[in-house]
Interface confidence: low
């Protein structure tokens, strides 16, 4: 019996087609993805093949103005329109709290939303009961397939799930649910979830009875053969893991942002054993037409976005200096504003010992592309912020050793004075440079804000200590020459859309007046 699994993950509100790098579509003839194009391909496959499942491995929420405005209603509407068969909860589904998940998505979705390792307690338990499930048995042709969900147990550090949801260890939580499916005579089981490729492989190895793992969170691109676009494969598609009980378990992920549709064909024998698996992600490029009915619906929903872009988010009573003459040479107040917003967006008081789990921010000055003049009545709009942060990136959480941070700050000024983008703006960090010293030895003082303290204060950076830092995904991926970050990071979790972080902060503060305050000094 043959099953076709179509899958997406980490779509991050890319409902409209995008450029090849998943930013805003500029030249339509070269654009990719989007739900209208996805629907065309899904329908084509559904017509051609008998047993098809369309699955999403989480993180539909967060990433563009679509989510900022519609807050998840757009996800439910268009996933319903595409007739998804199941979705796993990702960490970003909790970005607007549990309410922001329940109302727009859980209550509106016409497909099961799954997670076996999230347990509700207290008053929430009855409120959320049945709105998401640990597993779901889906009829497919003449057979049944069990789908069991999972979500990153790091979600409390990455999003806002509140105190009434407990995120258990994925493997511990999945095993009894898979066992339950076995007792129900379900012998074809897919683990669908959002914990990253390393955990996906562990689940394939450790959870007895899981036949296929469809994952997300790490934006992993797998491909067999010559890849069709710019993404570099982390391995072959499917990635085969040998389980502890000797089975070959295919593990798949489909990059992110709706650029690809994962396409996996699985052949099962009559006892539900995987005989063969093959496939590849399908690049959703302009050779695939956008479905006209979905496209018309997108255009209808778009109108509200255009209105939102020009509405006032808040006010500034000072000039927001985002000029390259400032931000690539010295501390600039636009850099301070953005870093303060990044830290504020990551406030998670999850432990009495810590005032927060993260206190530090770094931001490449070259990523700040425009100032904002206060003389326009002080008004700040989404449109203004899009000029400051035009690249559609995210502000991510990483864990780095102190020694890596030291290297990053040396790199920040290794060729100082040439208006290069690697000069770092900071938050929760005090750095002193001596430019008379040779490159690689210019950081003379590097103090960082403590987290395990009731009164935050600055202490010298310890080389061997592991620190959490918020930074742009561009830096996490080694951009602007920060190869040491990419090479030496100990953990990397994708965060929220950059503009959204800053706009939320400005809306919260209402009036802002960031200063240049001695975060970066030269001796």
């Amino acid at each position: 019996w043959e099953l076709t699994i179509l899958h997406t993950n980490d779509v991050h509100s890319r409902l409209e087609q995008t450029s090849e790098d998943s930013s805003k579509c500029v030249n339509a003839s070269r654009c990719m993805g989007g739900v209208a194009r996805l629907f065309t391909k899904v329908q084509q496959i559904r017509r051609a093949e008998p047993n098809v499942l369309l699955l999403d491995a989480g993180d539909q929420y967060q990433g563009t103005i679509w989510f900022t405005v519609y807050k998840g209603a757009e996800v439910a509407h268009f996933m319903n329109a595409l007739r998804y068969d199941a979705m796993a909860l990702g960490n970003h589904e909790f970005d607007n709290g549990v309410e922001g998940l329940i109302e727009p998505l859980l209550k509106e979705a016409k497909f099961p939303i799954l997670s076996a390792n999230i347990k509700a307690k207290g008053p929430l338990a009855s409120q959320i009961s049945g709105l998401y499930l640990p597993y779901k048995v889906l009829p497919v042709g003449d057979e049944v397939v069990g789908i069991v969900g999972y979500t990153s147990k790091e979600t409390p550090f990455l999003s806002n799930p509140g105190t009434n949801l407990v995120f258990e260890d994925e493997i511990t939580a999945l095993q009894p649910e898979v066992d339950k499916l076995k007792t129900l005579n379900v012998n074809k089981i897919i683990a669908l979830g959002h914990s990253g490729f390393e955990m996906d492989k562990l689940i394939a190895q450790k959870v007895r009875g899981v036949d296929v793992v469809v994952g997300g969170h790490s934006n992993t691109f797998l491909y067999t053969g010559n890849p069709p676009s710019k993404e570099v494969p982390a391995g072959k598609y499917p990635f085969i893991v040998t389980s502890d009980d000797g089975r070959k378990v295919p593990v798949v992920q489909a990059y992110a942002f709706g650029k690809y549709l994962g396409y996996l064909k699985i052949e099962f024998d009559e006892r539900g054993n995987v005989i063969s698996s093959h496939g590849n992600p399908i690049l959703l490029n302009s050779s695939i037409p956008e479905d006209p009915s979905i496209k018309a619906d997108i255009n209808k929903w778009r109108i509200k976005l255009d209105n939102y872009s020009t509405q006032e988010l808040g006010k500034t009573i000072v000039y927001l200096d985002g000029s390259s003459q400032s931000c690539r040479f010295r501390e600039c107040n636009m850099g301070n504003l953005i870093c303060d917003a990044m830290i504020n967006n990551n406030l998670r008081h999850t432990d009495e010992m810590f005032w927060n789990h993260v206190s530090m921010c770094i931001l490449n000055g070259g990523g700040i592309r425009s100032p904002i003049d206060e003389r326009n009545n002080g008004t700040i709009t989404w449109e203004n912020l899009a000029a400051v942060l035009p690249f559609g990136g995210t502000f991510d959480l990483v864990q780095l050793k102190g020694s890596t941070l030291k290297k990053a700050f040396e790199h920040s000024v290794h060729r100082y004075g040439q208006s290069t983008g690697e000069f770092l703006q900071v938050g929760g960090i005090h750095v002193v440079y001596d430019l008379s010293r040779k490159p690689g030895d210019r950081v003379v003082k590097l103090d960082v804000l403590c987290t395990k303290c009731r009164v935050p204060s600055y202490d010298p950076l310890k080389m061997d200590e592991v620190y959490k830092v918020i930074l742009p995904n561009f830096l996490a991926n080694g951009g602007d020459g920060f190869q040491m970050i990419k090479d030496e990071l100990l953990r990397h979790d994708s965060g929220d859309q950059d503009i959204n972080v800053v706009s939320t902060y400005i809306s919260k503060m209402k009036v802002i007046y960031p200063a240049v305050e001695g975060r970066i000094k030269f001796s």
Epitope: T224, N226, P227, K230, V232, P233, G235, K236, F239, I240, H278
Partner: antibody, heavy 117, light 107 residues
Framework: QVQLQQPGAELVRPGASVKLSCKAS????????MNWVKQRPEQGLEWIGK????????HYNQKFKDKAILTVDKSSSTAFMQLSSLTSEDSAVYYC??????????WGQGTTLTVSS | DIVMTQSPSSMYASLGERVTITCKAS??????LSWFQQKPGKSPKTLIY???ILVDGVPSGFSGSGSGQDYSLTISSLEYEDMGIYYC?????????FGGGTRLEIK
Amino acid sequence: QVQLQQPGAELVRPGASVKLSCKASGYTFTSYWMNWVKQRPEQGLEWIGKIDPYDSETHYNQKFKDKAILTVDKSSSTAFMQLSSLTSEDSAVYYCARIRYGTFDYWGQGTTLTVSS
Amino acid sequence: DIVMTQSPSSMYASLGERVTITCKASQDINNYLSWFQQKPGKSPKTLIYRANILVDGVPSGFSGSGSGQDYSLTISSLEYEDMGIYYCLQYDEFPYTFGGGTRLEIK
């Protein structure tokens, strides 16, 4: 750590065939394609072809289509290249190299093939 | 087949000097280009893939750039251990093809 072990040298007669081996260790053999590359003394590198150890799918350089046959033995995590109808033109160092990120990341030490009577 | 034209075929440079080697493809290869270093009697070592991505463990003094048909490898400050033969490879289309090599020697 990833290792690709190749025998140091092979001596064969003209007209004969030879089967060169490349034993992989330190990674999941079936997860990465294996390439073969030829290098003649004081000359550049030539790509012969590649094989997917998972399902034995192959891609050959047309120039070597009738010369080389690529195979694998999954049980021993070993890739093989059989070269037939050998002439002095086939005397060269032959490397196996694993593919990652679309290109070659780890190379074997190479086998020096000498075709001589 | 895509022809990769590498230049210069050989060069002498001084320690500490900035060195650039170029590779021109006969058609657009979409950044599917790698650079390798080979020392006498040794197998090649991969330095860069996708035109500009440095392989883990390769010194940061090496960098790659380019797009379309034209690519280059730069060594920011030549060191003694950088001498050897450098090859480019296109892996956009079968058959994969290498440049003719650049022999780099110390003055």
